[in-house]
């Protein structure tokens, strides 16, 4: 069937539209396009003769029509009179006519629409607005956006005269936001331009800061003024109920306690004409003096005195703080504080109290701080240490000896040989040493302010001839993964070359195996059974050379899975049954057998005489190692059959 | 956009034949009539007819019948002018056009010149 | 047929002056059904084939300058150039597309004075 679709149905003024045919029939003479709902000879707009390809104009024809050899007609610069009912009157080379109705509608293109408001600067939760969209248009459907959103479900919200006009009731400063409207035609769409509302509100009740409401005496006092206006608000200031100023800002410099009092601030706004305040009560501290710290003993001695620090002046209705090395104070059962915390008591001293301490004194608004005070903490001497540590030098050298022991005041130092006193120096010092200077090499330190006394006796031996060394170890009994183990060569020599033997090897080359202190050091880390072996160490120099005897490492390892022998799983009746189980392990492990998860006896072999088939089941062996404190098992199923047949052993 | 293009000028003797193409671009090829128009020498314009494009029916104006034939290939969208038994007087200046939905010619080649001479 | 007379057959004018050439048709051509003249008016430059100017006696062909205009009745019509210019220099043809066959005039040749 013939039939005339409009592309598009709906048409904006100036722009086209094509009317399209479908199903056109064939063999035509021709076709001619008439304005309304029939053939009418004086409302013919175009007619095409096919045999002429050629178009004739008729009386409705604009100068804006096209008319296409497909018989579809298009219409350009569309205006509103051209809406309605075009008719198609295809003639058929029979003559047989054949009609066929199509129709657009235009609309015109939108212009872009703006808001007018009855109200521009309506007051909070008092007045209404009412937007309008302008201008007024048939046919055109009005939409209204909120900061670009569709409006929201508000009871406050109305909208009225077919949507163009949109009500605020009571507005509050919530709505201020940006307002826009949109006309729609089928045509076109245009947003206006946003219209942003200007609500009054205000002022609510201001806020002064600082909350701080305590000064001291000295201080500036700055308070500001706030409160949610618009317009913004105008402020005034009132001290104890006298006015002071019309700022938002009140600025007192370098108050006193005559400071003290009530201070308001008030908010107005000019345009709703409403007033809000709000009062602080500001308090002003006189200056209290800064604390200093007494002490009761100014030189204590380690391990015997106390002392007790004090915090002054005392003041009453006053909270004292203290603080030791810049922290608060630890908890400690040496550490003791006087009921109104003014005093510290120190029991028992260590070298470790020295401090610093300060002590503080709170008041409403601060802490004041002491100046720091530092303990002199007598101590010492502890044993003194010589240096360097060799024991072994050749002949010819110098012998340079270093005594130092901590103490306070410092030690004072003595150097005695074979008992007899040398000098009273921290150093002694003998050049070109002989076998005579082989000795007992005495240091004694001593505290003059304590008295006490403290010796070190270092024996020096000067031979040509190296000494056998010997190898001390720092674990004589290393767990397996788990430990390392320090060999050290002694003794300690110098212009001395160290080495290190194997099983009568020279060192393996392993990431385990590490040299340290000039090689006088072996160190295994994470052992293994295969560690233990012979370690030997060597000395050398220029002129002579010594081994130490063997160090066997006992590597503590195990248990490790255990084997059941024989292997054998099935028994004839009558048989019987020996079961033996081996673990491997340092120290040897115990044993013990369960069967069926009954414990059975604390043995390495388990000897059953004469088995039935109830001794079917499993047996299980356990291995323990007290020493590594490992333990592990192994479970193994025994078949017992009767006498008679004869099962395929099987391991 | 529309353009016809022609073939290139021909020289022949009488008595000969000649073939002129028409190639058309730009356009559905068959919604619009093909013309032939001749430019004798110095002279005016003259319609020798036309053929329809999608019936593809001649039409020859009285003159130009016998030794005058259009043709088409719809296929490469193209027109023919074949003349046969040349004569001198055929010299000429053959355009072809493309007939406008009104009915002038809206789109021209650029012509073809034959020139018969012995 | 029907038979086109223009005049003059050439015509010299200034540059910048107007330029007027006729065309009579030997009946009317005239279709009262759409009350349409069917006439045509082309030019042909030296060397070129013709170009439309202008159709149904009075309405531009798109692109065509609007110093080119064109009027007339049933039989009497006139192509008007309102200020020749250089690329104006052509001969002129009116044609009717009234009745089969269509006719051409003799053509109108312009020229710069």
């Known amino acids: 069937k013939l039939t005339i679709e409009s592309t598009p149905f709906n048409v904006a003024e100036g722009k086209e539209v094509l009317l399209l045919v479908h199903n056109l029939p064939q063999h035509l003479f021709g076709y001619s396009w008439y304005k309304g709902e029939r053939v009418d000879g004086n409302r013919q707009i175009i007619g095409y003769v096919i045999g002429t390809q050629q178009a004739t104009p008729g009386p409705a024809y604009s100068g804006r029509e096209i008319i296409y050899p497909n018989a579809s007609l298009l219409i350009q610069n569309i205006i509103q009179n051209d809406t309605g009912f075009y008719t198609l009157h295809v003639i058929k080379s029979d003559l047989v006519n054949e009609e066929a109705t199509g129709q657009f509608r235009v609309y015109p293109e939108l212009p872009k629409p703006s808001i007018s408001s009855n109200n521009s600067k309506p007051v909070e939760d008092k007045d209404a607005v009412a937007f309008t969209c302008e201008p007024e248009t048939q046919d055109a459907t009005y939409l209204w956006w909120v900061n670009n959103q569709s409006l929201p479900v508000s009871p406050r919200l109305q909208l009225s005269n077919g949507n163009r006009t949109l009500t605020l009731f009571n507005v509050t400063r919530n709505d201020t936001a940006s307002y826009k409207c949109e006309t729609q035609n089928p045509v076109s769409a245009r947003r206006s331009d946003s219209v942003i509302l200007n609500v009054l509100y205000g002022p609510d009740a201001p806020t002064i800061s600082p909350l701080n409401t305590s000064y001291r005496s000295g201080e500036n006092l700055n308070l500001s003024c706030h409160a949610a206006s618009n317009p913004p608000a105008q402020y005034s200031w009132f001290v104890n109920g006298t006015f002071q100023q019309s700022t938002q800002e009140l600025f007192i410099p370098n108050i006193t306690v005559n400071n003290s009092g009530s201070y308001t601030c008030q908010a107005h706004n000019s345009d709703t004409g409403l007033n809000r305040t709000t009062v602080t009560t500001i308090t002003v501290y006189a200056e209290p003096p800064k604390p200093f710290i007494t002490s009761n003993n100014s030189n204590p001695v380690e391990d015997e005195d106390a002392v007790a620090l004090t915090c002054e002046p005392e003041i009453q209705n006053t909270t004292y703080l203290w603080w030791v090395n810049n922290q608060s104070l630890p908890v400690s059962p040496r550490l003791q504080l006087s009921n109104d915390n003014r005093t510290l008591t120190l029991l028992s001293v260590t070298r470790n109290d020295v401090g610093p301490y300060e002590c503080g004194i709170q008041n409403k608004l601060s802490v004041d701080h002491s100046d720091p005070v530092i303990l002199n903490v007598l101590y010492g001497p502890d044993d003194p240490t010589i240096s360097p540590s060799y024991t072994y030098y050749r002949p010819g050298v110098n012998l340079s000896l270093s005594c130092h022991a901590a103490s306070n005041p410092p030690a004072q130092y003595s150097w005695l040989i074979d008992g007899n006193i040398q000098q009273h120096t921290q150093e002694l010092f003998i050049s070109n040493i002989t076998e005579k200077n082989s000795g007992l090499y005495t240091c004694q330190a001593n505290n003059s302010a304590s008295g006490h006394s403290r010796t070190t006796v270092k024996t020096i031996t000067v031979s040509a001839e190296l000494p056998k060394p010997s190898i001390s170890s720092n674990n004589s009994k290393p767990v397996e993964d788990k430990d390392a183990v320090a060999f050290t060569c002694e003794p300690e020599a110098q212009n001395t070359t160290y080495l290190w033997w194997v099983n009568g090897q020279s060192l393996p080359v392993s990431p385990r195996l590490q040299l340290s202190n000039g090689n006088r050091t072996l160190t295994l880390f994470n052992v293994t059974r295969n560690d233990a072996r012979a370690y030997v160490c060597g000395i050398q120099n220029s002129v002579s050379a010594n081994r130490s005897d063997p160090v066997t490492l006992d590597v503590l390892y195990g248990p490790d899975t255990p084997i059941i022998s024989p292997p054998d799983s099935s028994y004839l009746s009558g048989a019987n049954l020996n079961l033996s189980c081996h673990s491997a392990s340092n120290p040897s492990p115990q044993y013990s057998w369960r069967i069926n998860g009954i414990p059975q006896q604390h043995t390495q072999v388990l000897f059953i005489a004469k088995i039935t088939p109830n001794n079917n089941g499993t047996y299980a062996c356990f291995v323990s190692n007290l020493a590594t404190g490992r333990n592990n098992s192994i479970v193994k199923s025994i078949t017992v059959s009767a006498s008679g047949t004869s099962p395929g052993l099987s391991a | 956009q529309v353009q016809l293009v022609q073939s290139g000028s021909e020289l022949k003797k009488p008595g000969a034949s000649v073939k002129v193409s028409c190639k058309a671009s730009?356009?559905?090829?068959?919604?619009?009539?093909v013309n032939w128009v001749r430019q004798a020498p110095g002279q005016g314009l003259e319609w020798m007819g036309w053929?329809?494009?999608?019936?593809?029916?001649?039409t020859y104006v009285q003159g130009f019948t016998g030794r005058f034939v259009f043709s088409l290939d719809t296929s490469v969208t193209t027109a023919y002018l074949h003349i046969s038994s040349l004569k001198a007087e055929d010299t000429a200046v053959y355009f072809c056009?493309?007939?406008?939905?009104?009915?002038?010619?809206?789109?021209w080649g650029q012509g073809t010149l034959v020139t018969v001479s012995s | 047929d029907i038979v086109m007379t223009q005049s003059p057959d050439s015509l010299a004018v200034s540059l910048g002056e107007r330029a007027t050439i006729n065309c009579k048709s030997s009946?009317?051509?005239?279709?009262?059904?759409?009350?349409?003249?069917?006439l045509a008016w082309y030019q042909q430059r030296p060397g070129q084939p013709p170009k439309l100017l202008i159709y149904?006696?009075?309405t531009r062909e798109s692109g065509v300058p609007d110093r080119f205009s064109g009027s007339g009745s049933g039989t009497d019509f006139t192509l008007t150039i309102s200020s020749l210019q250089a690329e104006d220099v052509a001969v002129y043809y009116c044609?009717?597309?009234?009745?089969?066959?269509?006719?051409f005039g003799g053509g109108t040749k312009v020229e710069i004075k």
């Open positions: 056009a493309r007939k406008g939905i009104w009915g002038p010619f809206d789109h």
């Open positions: 730009g356009y559905t090829f068959t919604n619009y009539g």
């Open positions: 053929i329809n494009t999608n019936t593809g029916n001649p």
């Open positions: 009946q009317s051509v005239l279709y009262s059904s759409n009350n349409r003249l069917y």
């Open positions: 149904w006696a009075s």
């Open positions: 044609q009717q597309y009234y009745s089969n066959p269509w006719t």
